[in-house]
């Protein structure tokens, strides 16, 4: 592990041998002030106590400033997703500086000495700052540091050692390995800053977990439940990339969230809204699409300060690439059945038809079991905007599609000979839309005829009878 | 699948120097690194050093940092160490393997190199 | 550099024991130790990584434990197959380092 020494920290890797034997002397930690979109161009080193680089590359004092910080690299140089999000910030604050924190000797090394580096990192980060509050007009509140994966723990231990309270930490998807159940000064924490956002999009409960489960932010978003991203698995990075293997499904999931924040940035009009919840599966539910008492956020650069909240988990689903915001529904169906239907879980899906456009012919996902004689709720979501919901349709996938339904088909029959039809009675749906928070009630067209049977579909209409529309809409909503 | 090939054994003389070869298939090559294990008779696994293809990086135990040269060659897809001033010391199994990052584990093994050095 | 610790080199066991193998550190390694099978042709395979996580593909009578400088591979039900080398190695930092490895055969 290379041991930084020298004022500005400098490294000497010993066991790294290059072709021709040669000790090579880098910086460990620089500040690059990014003065162009560019990423070819130099931009501008910034170094403590000394003052000519900030006039000569005309930092602004009295703007916003970000300092990217990026996580472990095996490469040893920059990721695409740097100067992406450099230039997604530059077409959004046009007056702001950008920093990029190279700190890429420390963290081109095995993991877990790039962890152990990260404290001495931050610590650099730390002087700078504490530097740069001695400029007159330097504001800390206006500095938000961004660190993705090793990154955002580099960023809590900035804001940990700086002298004051940093405007906001951004985390992008905060490391796992070595953090996971960390006391809060050895990892990023709602204390690091005014204000900590995180965005979780590699977690998991097997193998591995590259991300960090655990909230660690004032808020801690968990887009599509923090795990399988859409547009990631094998097949889609097959697709891709000669050879996919299970390293682009990692690097992609985890790196989703860095693209989820530079969506937030460039796609202004299309935010993207989570909703807090306890956990995955209560989301997965469709039971909390509530913005009532700040239960909603945008997500990314636009997220609302929540000071008050500390590890609130918040949930949204996403698609598979940018723009990423889809429109979230709650469907809640009473459902009765006269006719038992056994121990196979229907298969129903739902087309939505608004003003604007139809859905797509969506699955209800059951992600425990069907409660018959109860009100259920469903989560279902679309790519586009539909605009306000004029009928629904539902319908009730045929029989036997796998050998599982085909057996407990056959063994329903068995258990139930002179009653074998399956069929539910649904008279109304309850729709409430989690981005307009708008709720409307629909019912069958005709009472008489609300049975629904396998292979079957019920067609619904916005009640008659003084259907309900609360138009309450969400403090987040038409932001642009 | 993932594939490392191992070149054939060698029988060399004290003093001279050899190169084994670890051709990787069923994976993007310059995503990985290769590291290097030695192996002698009946004995235990000891660390030699890593290769990673994406961007040149070496690494090397202290101890073989004398002893061994890591290269690769891109368009074929092969890691190759090079042992050099050659003793019976060195005679020995060398494996090569595949890093999985983050885990820092050898996820997947050549079938091994047996080198004998005898006059 | 880490020294890694088998203290038994070779065990003997019958056909569906249940054996576990042990590995000490000489300081914390936070998680990051692996277990390796040797087999008698020389083949080597990666069992468990990160103290317990099951490599793809291994059948689920291994398991992993520990935490800190002690830790321990367990076969629940030894099978045939089983019979080889087992080596645990370290990967908290370089030199990687393994340990001696225990020998298992059937009794």
């Known amino acids: 592990s290379p041991v930084p020494f020298g004022p500005e920290g400098r490294l000497e890797d010993k066991l790294h041998k290059p072709k021709a034997t040669q000790t090579e002397v880098k910086p460990s930690v620089r500040f690059n002030l990014r003065t162009s979109k560019d990423p070819e161009h130099e931009g501008c080193y910034l170094s403590v106590g000394h003052s000519q680089p900030l006039e000569d590359c005309s930092f602004n004092m009295t703007a916003k400033t970000f300092f990217i910080i990026h996580g472990w690299t095996m490469s040893g140089i920059f990721e695409n997703w740097l100067h992406k999000l450099v230039s997604a910030l530059h077409t959004r604050e046009k007056d702001a500086n950008v920093v990029v924190v190279d700190w890429l000797p420390l963290a081109h090394q095995l993991y877990t000495d790039a962890v152990n580096n990260t404290r001495v990192v931050g610590h650099s980060i730390a002087r700078m700052l504490d530097w740069l509050q001695e400029k007159d007009d330097f504001s800390l509140g206006n500095v938000h540091l961004i660190g993705y994966s090793l990154g955002a723990h580099v960023a809590g231990y900035a804001g940990n050692f700086v002298k004051g309270t940093v405007g906001r930490i951004t985390g992008l998807d905060p490391a796992g390995p070595m953090f996971e159940g960390a006391d809060i000064h050895k990892r990023l924490s709602p204390d690091d800053a005014d204000f900590v956002d995180v965005l979780h999009t590699y977690t998991r409960s097997f193998g591995l977990s590259i991300g960090i489960q655990m909230p660690v932010g004032h808020i801690d978003i968990y887009p599509n439940g923090g795990d399988f991203q859409p547009g990631c698995g094998l097949n889609d990075v097959l697709g891709s990339i000669a050879y996919g293997t299970i390293t682009e499904v990692v690097k992609c999931e985890h790196e989703r969230a860095v693209h989820l924040f530079v969506d937030s940035l460039v796609n202004q009009d299309k935010p993207s809204f989570a909703f807090q919840c306890t956990d995955s599966n209560r989301f997965k539910k469709g039971i909390c699409l509530s913005c009532r008492k700040n239960r909603c956020n945008n997500i990314g650069y636009n997220a609302k300060k929540m000071r008050k909240k500390r590890n609130s988990k918040m949930y949204l689903k996403t698609r598979a690439g940018m723009p990423f915001k889809v429109y979230h529904y709650q469907l809640k169906v009473h459902m009765f059945s006269y006719n038992n239907s056994g121990d196979t879980q229907p298969t129903l899906y739902i087309t939505l038809y608004g003003s604007n456009a139809d859905s797509q012919n969506l699955p209800l996902e059951i992600v425990e079991k069907i409660e018959l004689n109860a009100t259920n709720t469903f989560l279902v979501y679309t790519e586009e905007d539909l605009g306000d919901l004029l009928k629904m349709r539902l319908t009730w996938e045929g029989v036997a599609h796998s050998w599982y339904n085909l057996w407990n088909e056959f063994r329903n029959y068995l258990s139930q000979p002179s009653n074998p039809s399956r069929e539910l009675y649904i008279r109304r749906i309850r729709v409430k839309s989690g981005e307009t928070q708008r709720k409307v009630t629909f019912c069958t067209q005709d009472p008489t005829k609300s049975s629904i049977s396998p292979g079957q579909e019920l067609w619904f209409h916005k009640c008659q009878d003084g259907w309900k529309m609360k138009n309450k809409t969400s403090p987040f909503v038409n932001l642009a | 699948q993932v594939q490392l090939q191992q070149s054939g054994a060698e029988l060399v003389k004290p003093g001279a120097s050899v190169r084994l070869s670890c051709k990787a298939s069923?994976?993007?090559?310059?995503?990985?690194?290769i590291h290097w294990v030695k192996q002698r008779s009946g004995q235990g696994l000891e660390w030699i050093g890593w290769?990673?293809?994406?961007?040149?990086?070496?690494k090397y135990n202290e101890k073989f940092k004398d002893k061994a040269t890591l290269t690769a060659d891109k368009s074929s897809r092969t890691v190759y160490m090079e042992l050099s001033r050659l003793t019976s010391e060195d005679s020995a199994v060398y494996f090569c393997a595949r890093h999985e990052e983050y885990t820092n584990s050898l996820a997947y093994w050549g079938q091994g190199t047996l080198v004998t050095v005898s006059a | 550099d880490i020294q890694m610790t088998q203290t038994t080199s070779s065990l003997s066991a019958s056909l569906g024991d249940r054996v576990t193998i042990s590995c000490r550190a000489s300081q914390d390694i936070s998680n990051y130790l692996n277990w390796y099978q040797q087999q008698p042709d020389g083949t080597v395979k990666l069992l468990i990584y990160?103290?317990?996580r099951l490599h793809s593909g291994v059948p689920s009578r291994f398991s992993g434990s520990g935490s800190g400088t002690d830790y321990s591979l367990t076969i629940s039900n030894l099978e045939q197959e089983d019979i080889a080398t087992y080596f645990c190695?370290?990967?908290?930092?370089?030199?990687?380092?393994f340990g001696g490895g225990t020998n298992l055969e059937i009794k």
């Open positions: 990160y103290t317990s």
């Open positions: 069923g994976y993007t090559f310059t995503k990985y690194t």
């Open positions: 190695q370290q990967g908290y930092t370089l030199p990687w380092t």
């Open positions: 290769f990673y293809p994406g961007s040149d990086s070496i």
